[in-house]
């Protein structure tokens, strides 16, 4: 029998500091640039090695970052996510959801992480 | 499997241009910043220019700017580094590198890239 892929997601509040190269990671999506299906979410692309993020080491390649500083990033064009990101001063308050991919047992059992459920 | 593959380099006269070009394969071209570095003979690979996603915006190197002006075709996962009025200071092997998303870190460190192409030569003579 084949097991199956569930995700269990998760949000965190990182509260970053912005360092001397600034907050050391690299984004995709907007609603002009689709980095999953049917969502033009901000993505995290890249963390940059010894960057205030990794240094910090909650956020991960993969997280979507919900809002910067208290302001939502939904329905943003990428260039404008990338502006606010600039602009968002020196300590910098990210809401992220982390989606952590869990081996559920055999089809049919629903497992925790399941997000139908 | 990532490839980025340059080409249009040569040996050619001070004052005269060159079109760099490399290609891309293996990755999703359009969520990519790319960029070009160069590496004279025994110095440090060097910032040369970058280009966002979209093309839309693009920085350069107080060295180079006003001669050379880089682009991207996103429907064809290409980049080009048109170079114009070379000098023999410009002489180095070139270097076509890439990094998925909008860095928020800086763009001009080799170390803010995860892909390389293996580089073409450039020589400028007197």
């Known amino acids: 029998m084949n097991g199956r892929v569930d995700y269990l997601v998760t949000e965190e509040e990182i509260n970053l500091t912005r360092g001397p190269s600034g907050l050391g990671f690299n984004i995709v999506g907007g609603t002009d640039q689709q980095y999953v299906s049917n969502d033009s979410g901000i993505y995290v692309s890249r963390i940059k090695e010894n960057g205030a993020a990794a240094l910090d080491g909650r956020l991960q390649e993969g997280d979507k970052i919900l809002s910067v500083n208290g302001q939502d990033l939904k329905n943003l064009l990428h260039q404008d996510a990338v502006d606010l990101f600039r602009n968002a001063g020196y300590a910098v308050s990210l809401r992220v959801q982390h989606r952590l991919q869990v081996q559920n047992g055999p089809i049919g059992h629903r497992g925790e992480g399941d997000p139908s459920g | 499997d990532v490839q980025l593959v340059e080409s249009g380099g040569g040996l050619v006269q001070a004052g005269d241009s060159l079109r760099l070009s490399c290609a891309a394969s293996?990755?999703?071209?359009?969520?990519?910043?790319m960029a070009w570095f160069r590496q004279a003979p025994g110095k440090e690979r060097d910032f040369v220019a970058t280009?966002?996603?979209?093309?839309?915006?693009?920085n350069y190197a107080d060295s180079v700017k006003g001669r050379f002006t880089i682009s991207r075709d996103n429907a064809k996962n290409t980049v080009t580094l048109q170079m114009n009025s070379l000098q023999p200071e410009d002489t180095a092997v070139y270097y076509c590198?890439?990094?998925?998303?909008?860095?928020?870190?800086?763009?001009?460190?080799?170390?803010?890239?995860?892909?390389w192409g293996q580089g073409t030569q450039v020589t400028v003579s007197e």
């Open positions: 590198a890439g990094v998925p998303g909008t860095s928020l870190s800086g763009e001009t460190d080799p170390r803010d890239y995860d892909y």
């Open positions: 293996g990755i999703t071209f359009r969520w990519y910043t």
């Open positions: 280009i966002n996603w979209s093309g839309s915006d693009t």
